[in-house]
């Protein structure tokens, strides 16, 4: 029998200082461009080396921004994603939502790590 | 670095069927969107049609429902299916792999490009 993959999803806030690269990783995603069908979420692409959010740590490949400096990131076009990151000044705060694979067991039996029930 | 490699170029009638295959290796990210463009003589390079690595689909207007973008995340490749070709699909079609707008000093469109395959639609 094969396993369930599920998600663990965890909301974090992350505070990043801008680097001499900037705040050192990509995005993809926005209403003209969606990553994901039917979500027009903004999602980490990569994490340059050596920059600000390697540095940290925290941030990881795959994680939904949610927020830059509390303004909401829904709904909005790439570029306009874009410039808001570009105007937020030198303190960079960032609600994540990060997207765990949690490997549950054979279907119909209940793993340890399942929380249902 | 990133390398790609198109194949699957050639001189069809209209009317007739391609399918453009793109490889790609190097250090690509496991987030990423891959696509296909195009450029006639004397035209702009344009978007023809791009996948992402979460599943969303892109086309142009003017191939919608004659080609289909599909691709394989286990081999780093994307493929496009073009049925129906007319005379005005002739161009050199670029693959492209985009990982996304880097916010650095920049803020530039983070992507690489095939050396392109040429069809003909006689």
């Known amino acids: 029998m094969n396993g369930r993959v599920d998600y663990l999803v965890t909301e974090e806030e992350i505070n990043l200082t801008r680097g001499p690269s900037g705040l050192g990783f990509n995005i993809v995603g926005g209403t003209d461009q969606q990553y994901v069908s039917n979500d027009s979420g903004i999602y980490v692409s990569r994490i340059k080396e050596n920059g600000a959010a390697a540095l940290d740590g925290r941030l990881q490949e795959g994680d939904k921004i949610l927020s830059v400096n509390g303004q909401d990131l829904k709904n909005l076009l790439h570029q306009d994603a874009v410039d808001l990151f570009r105007n937020a000044g030198y303190a960079v705060s960032l609600r994540v939502q990060h997207r765990l694979q949690v490997q549950n067991g054979p279907i119909g039996h209940r793993g340890e790590g399942d929380p249902s029930g | 670095d990133v390398q790609l490699v198109e194949s699957g170029g050639g001189l069809v009638q209209a009317g007739g069927s391609l399918r453009l295959s793109c490889a790609a290796s190097g250090s690509i990210g496991s987030i990423n969107i891959m696509g296909w463009y195009r450029q006639a003589p004397g035209k702009q390079r344009e978007l023809v049609a791009s996948?992402?690595?979460?599943?969303?689909?892109n086309y142009a207007d003017s191939v919608k429902g004659r080609f289909t973008i599909s691709r394989d995340n286990a081999k780093n490749a994307v493929y496009l299916q073009m049925n129906s070709l007319k005379p005005e699909d002739t161009a050199v079609y670029y693959c492209?792999?985009?990982?996304?707008?880097?916010?650095?000093?920049?803020?530039?469109?983070?992507?690489?490009w095939g050396r392109g395959t040429q069809v003909t639609v006689s």
């Open positions: 492209n792999l985009a990982r996304g707008t880097h916010l650095g000093d920049s803020f530039e469109r983070d992507d690489y």
């Open positions: 996948i992402t690595s979460g599943g969303a689909t």
